[in-house]
């Protein structure tokens, strides 16, 4: 049976959404983004043990083959299942504009 | 400038499509799949160095933060960008049926 969201490695060890506080300098954006100067970056971090938040059939296959051939096939990886949009205010040749991004901040996570 | 598909680690070391030969037993499907008995599983394997096949802005952020905080933020991960469908012949309660899977075999890869 799939254990879905229960982490067998202990609380907080498995694939989940984390928030990392970052400045524009950290992100390498200081030259072209005016605002905000700080971003609460949400990203997917953590281990992907068997059956934990498996995204699809491919993830199941990958885990099974990883157990058989760990040197050849890596374990599934914790990545965004969907994203939260964000608007940045940027410098442009003509002045200042709003720039919209659909794929900047992770919204939830799964194992692929 | 983005280096896109050129692997700075040497040929074949970066995120790309690999084929792994697997039996139904390897996949854990022997109980419910009749055919095929062997599958050429295509999956995404390899390193994700800076700017290599970055899927989106999130991948760029993740790489920048990984360089700053390698113990906290992992590097981007090599995962399928799209999938090839596959048809399996399965046992069912009523006999045998064709079952199509859209998310079984990786078609191409990127870093997220």
């Amino acid at each position: 049976a799939r254990n879905g969201d229960r982490c067998p490695l202990g609380p907080g060890r498995c694939c989940r959404l984390h928030t990392v506080h970052a400045s524009l300098e950290d992100l390498g954006w200081a030259d072209w983004v005016l605002s905000p100067r700080e971003v609460q970056v949400t990203m997917c971090i953590g281990a992907c043990p068997s059956q934990f938040r498996e995204a699809n059939m491919h993830a199941q296959i990958k885990m099974n083959l990883h157990r058989l051939k760990p040197d050849t096939v890596p374990a599934p990886c914790c990545v965004p299942a969907s994203y939260n949009p964000m608007v940045l205010i940027q410098k442009t040749d003509t002045g200042v504009s709003l720039q919209t991004y659909d794929d900047l901040l992770a919204k939830d996570c799964h194992c692929v | 400038a983005r280096n896109g598909d050129r692997c700075p680690l040497g040929p074949g070391r970066c995120c790309r499509l690999h084929t792994v030969h697997a039996s139904l037993e390897d996949l854990g499907w022997a109980d419910w799949v009749l055919s095929p008995r062997e599958v050429q599983v295509t999956m995404c394997i390899g390193a994700c160095p800076s700017q290599f096949r970055e899927a989106n802005m999130h991948a760029q952020i993740k790489m920048n933060l990984h360089r700053l905080k390698p113990d906290t933020v992992p590097a981007p991960c090599c995962v399928p960008a799209s999938y090839n469908p596959m048809v399996l012949i399965q046992k069912t309660d009523t006999g045998v049926s064709l079952q199509t899977y859209d998310d079984l075999l990786a078609k191409d890869c990127h870093c997220v």
């Epitope: 605002s35 100067r37 700080e38 609460q40 949009p85 964000m86 608007v87 205010i89 200042v96 709003l98 | -």
Partner: antibody, heavy 120, light 107 residues
């Protein structure tokens, strides 16, 4: 918590200048831009412009261009909005609002508002 | 400039009712829409950003949906404190523009 506190109500004569202040606390002032919005009595909300304390870059609404100036003082974490050549139709409550942490074009939190009355 | 049209301009409802307010943009704005609540004599309060993301601290009875040009704010079960005026605002491009507002009144 994040707070924006605005200066008190003002009564001005037509042709005069008003300067409204907005003091920020509870966050790093130059990390987020400030928007200014006004609301005439019984009317809806009208966006006036935006400023980032970090660089002083501004964007103004076209209809106010030439009459409005937005500035910041990072030493006191205060934003200012100056409106010149006041007319009776500038009578409104003037609000400052910080960029939302999630997206720069959503506004929140807001200051409590400053009523500016233009009357001869 | 992008024009924002809200409807209805006012709605009478009772506590417990489901209330829906719509907002239409004059051109596509993807998901870049915010909703605000304003009570008399008070500053507006951000409820929803990016069309459907609930601002921290806002009750879950408020929800937003839509994309492109048509958007909806829904209050699933109206509470006494929800009687107020609601505004939509596009955040896709400068100048930012607001809808005309929808007053939710007690029936």
């Amino acid at each position: 918590q994040v707070q924006l506190v605005q200066s008190g109500a003002e009564v001005k004569k037509p042709g005069a200048t008003v300067k409204v202040s907005c003091k920020a606390s509870g966050y790093t002032f130059d990390s987020y831009g400030i928007h200014w919005v006004r609301q005439a009595p019984g009317q809806g909300l009208e966006w006036m412009g935006w400023i980032t304390a970090y660089s002083g870059d501004t964007v103004y609404a076209q209809k106010l261009q030439g009459r409005v100036t937005m500035t910041t003082d990072t030493s006191t974490s205060t934003a200012y909005m100056e409106l010149r050549s006041l007319r009776s139709d500038d009578t409104a409550v003037y609000y400052c609002a910080r960029e939302s942490g999630q997206t720069s074009s959503a506004l929140g939190p807001w200051g409590q508002g400053t009523l500016v009355t233009v009357s001869s | 400039d992008i024009q924002m049209t809200q409807s209805p301009s006012s709605v009478s409802a009772s506590v417990g009712d489901r209330v829906t307010i719509t907002c239409r943009a004059s051109q596509g704005i993807s998901r870049w829409l915010a909703w605000y609540q304003q009570k008399p004599g008070k500053a507006p309060k951000l409820l929803i950003y990016a069309a459907s993301s609930l601002q921290s601290g806002v009750p879950s009875r408020f929800s937003g949906s839509g994309s492109g040009t048509d958007f909806t704010l829904t209050i699933s079960s109206l509470q006494p404190e929800d009687f107020a005026t609601y505004y939509c605002q596009q955040g896709a491009s400068f100048p930012l523009t607001f809808g005309g507002g929808t007053k939710v009144e007690i029936k």
